[in-house]
């Protein structure tokens, strides 16, 4: 028969700074050799090579190093290719063509997406407020991708739509920072909610605020930090936000500021004697010296790794001094479950079988729920297995063992419970006797 | 023994249109992929359709996509190229040629497009 | 696409003789390359596919040779029929598979 290349309908989306995998299968023809094959991965609209199998041979990468095949399973027809360490430039569609005697193609789509950071709220003015002044908040939230969607609403949940310019702007990884800004006249008192919407991963991110006109200032130094933790994916950037109040004529001169881990009180960085003292945390953190002057005492940490997580300490030293402590909540995507079964060939209802389900390079802990073709949860019979690797991301490995009917479908969700994301794979067995091919 | 014969050409006027048709026999049609090469008057050939086993994939050099469409009826072993836009250009004498396996194994005798006023 | 350049574009030989003809690639087409020999009038006839091996009825005085970029086909003890036109062709990648220039091979 004709070569069939096949690849998923819908876009693949991978997040930014993880690996993503653009399935591609074919019907290999019985007897077929890898010496016949020909595969081509380009970019569908330059034609650029990204990767190439000819001669029997994995040719290797043609596109900065971060493609690789998947080479024990060619055999099988599966040209699957995995690109790491995804940007915001990969976005597009890549062709997948097969040759051996016939030949095929098929394009397949990549949606890049990064989560938007927790908004970040300011208010200008910010102090000796009465109502009827008219104030403007600002609400950042950064590094998500694609642009976002910006709404306001009031402590009672109407939305706000007046007095509100929202700008987008892109760094040189292509991920945007997103500034809204809101201008209303104050009430007695009154709560304003920012919220930031990924489009793509239909990600919300949200914040508050709010304001009780005529509080009377202490004069003291007040650092603020998030109460919620800031969440991180591993291998992106994260920015621990913390600000403090200087007074009048404050001088940079004038600034200890100091971060460090709070439980062994190691010292992260330092600004001193007017001048930024450098990371003490293995060269990956820093603060945004131009913003220092105007309190923005933040730390941006780079490359976060797993061991990262716990809890950071800012404290500021003026004349007065004050700290506050925020904590960092490192994540990262489980991949889309693979689905084994043992045994896999000539199965009859009343066959006990292994059903596996896979995810990768996960964090934190996943949960993992199955359930069966009509969304009953499958809870007997269930053994999951968690491992850390040395990037202490996990590996989890869930097996239900069932005894089959007539047909069914089995299903497996991954649940990362800090990021609220579900990966899924799903298995069905149907007919008598049958054998299981694997979804590529 | 295999043969593909070519048919369709003739003179067209600038900005016509005309269809080819090629016929396949004495081997199994249906699992080849096929392709349109043509040969302009100064004995250059150039690639201008494939298509693949089945008819799912087609492919055109960027200069004649939109103009040019090959098609196939592995059930009548033939196959198809439907030329429209025609330009002077394109005059030329116009092979059917498989495409299996890597090498073109069976090509047709050809035939003569004249696109003239 | 890829570019195939033929040399030479012509040449004179005498029976008997034996000539090499070359065809280089802008890039690599992992011997996935035809040679075809066309006379006077006729259509093109496949001699060698994937740069070694010959096809079907082609006398064992053609062989082909090369891999990467560079290919060649030689044609040793020259026959009368063996004058014409002689094209190479890739089939790497996704089509257009384009065809080399060609050589005119004449008698001398």
């Known amino acids: 028969g004709a070569l069939e290349v096949q690849v998923p309908e819908d876009p693949v989306v991978a997040l930014v700074g993880t690996d993503a995998t653009l399935c591609c299968s074919f019907s290999p023809e019985p007897g077929f050799s890898l010496a016949q094959l020909n595969l081509i991965w380009q970019l569908t609209d330059t034609k650029q090579l990204v990767h190439s199998f000819a001669e029997g041979q994995d040719q290797g990468s043609a596109y900065a190093n971060r493609t690789a095949l998947f080479p024990d399973l060619l055999a099988q027809g599966n040209a699957s290719l995995r690109l790491q360490r995804v940007r915001v430039a990969d976005e597009g569609s890549f062709t997948c063509f097969v040759s051996i005697r016939d030949f095929g193609s098929a394009a397949v789509s990549l949606q890049v997406a990064a989560p938007y950071s927790k908004p970040s709220m300011t208010l200008e003015p910010n102090k000796d407020l009465r109502p009827g002044d008219t104030v403007t908040i600002t609400c950042s939230s950064y590094q998500g991708y694609p642009e976002a969607e910006v709404f306001w609403q009031d402590g009672q949940g109407v939305p706000l739509t007046g007095n509100v310019t929202t700008s987008q702007m892109a760094n040189e990884q292509g991920l945007f920072d997103v500034h809204s800004i809101l201008r209303v006249v104050l009430g007695a008192n009154g709560t304003y909610s920012c919220l930031v919407r990924n489009p793509v991963l239909q990600q919300d991110a949200h914040s508050s605020v709010t304001i009780t006109p005529q509080r009377s200032p202490t004069g003291a130094v007040e650092v603020q930090v998030p109460e919620d933790p800031v969440v991180a994916l591993v291998g992106t950037d994260a920015t621990l936000r913390c600000s403090f109040s200087p007074e009048p004529g404050f001088s940079l001169a004038q600034l200890n500021l100091i971060w460090q881990l709070t439980d062994t009180k190691q010292l992260v960085h330092s600004f001193t004697e007017g001048r930024d003292q450098g990371s003490a945390y293995a060269n990956r953190t820093a603060l945004f010296p131009d913003l220092l002057a105007q309190g923005n005492a933040s730390l941006r940490l780079q490359r976060v790794r797993v061991a990262d997580e716990g809890s950071f300490t800012c404290f500021v030293s003026i004349r007065d001094f004050g700290s506050a402590a925020v904590s960092l909540q490192v994540a990262a995507p489980y991949s889309k479950p693979s689905m084994t079964l043992e045994p896999n060939k000539d199965l009859r209802p009343g066959d006990t079988v292994t059903i596996t389900c896979s995810s990768y390079r996960g964090y934190p802990e996943a949960e993992v729920f199955w359930q069966d073709g009509q969304g009953v949860p499958l809870t007997g019979n269930v053994t999951t297995s968690q491992m850390a690797n040395e990037q202490g991301l996990f590996d989890v490995h869930s097996v239900l063992r069932v005894v089959l009917g007539a047909n069914g479908t089995y299903s497996c969700l991954v649940r990362n419970p800090v990021l609220q994301q579900d990966a899924h794979g799903s298995v069905t067995i149907t007919g008598q006797p049958m054998t299981f091919p694997p979804e590529a | 023994g295999a043969s593909v014969v070519e048919s369709g050409g003739g003179l067209v006027q600038p900005g016509g249109s005309l269809k080819l048709s090629c016929a396949a026999s004495?081997?199994?049609?249906?699992?080849?992929?096929m392709s349109w090469v043509r040969q302009t008057p100064d004995k250059r050939l150039e690639l201008v359709a494939t298509?693949?086993?089945?008819?799912?994939?087609?492919y055109y050099p960027d200069s004649l996509k939109g103009r040019f469409t090959i098609s196939r009826d592995n059930a009548k072993n033939t196959l198809y190229l439907q030329m429209s836009s025609l330009k002077s250009e394109d005059t030329a004498i116009y092979y059917c040629?498989?495409?299996?396996?890597?090498?073109?194994?069976?090509w047709g005798q050809g035939t003569l497009v004249t696109v003239s006023a | 696409d890829i570019l195939l350049t033929q040399s030479p574009a012509s040449l004179s030989v005498s029976v008997g003789e034996t000539v090499t003809i070359t065809c280089r690639a802008s890039?690599?087409?992992?011997?996935?390359l035809a040679w075809y020999h066309q006379k006077q009038g006729k259509s093109p006839q496949l001699l060698v596919y994937?740069?070694?091996n010959l096809a079907d009825g082609v006398p064992s005085r053609f062989s082909g040779s090369g891999s990467g970029t560079q290919y060649s086909l030689k044609i040793s003890s020259l026959q009368s029929e063996d004058f014409g036109s002689y094209y190479c062709?890739?089939?790497?990648?996704?089509?257009?598979?384009?065809f080399g220039g060609g050589t005119k091979l004449e008698i001398k």
């Open positions: 062709q890739h089939f790497w990648g996704i089509p257009p598979w384009t």
């Open positions: 994937t740069a070694t």
């Open positions: 040629a498989s495409a299996e396996g890597r090498r073109g194994a069976y």
């Open positions: 298509i693949n086993s089945d008819g799912v994939n087609t």
């Open positions: 004495g081997f199994t049609f249906s699992t080849f992929g």
């Open positions: 890039e690599n087409v992992y011997s996935n």
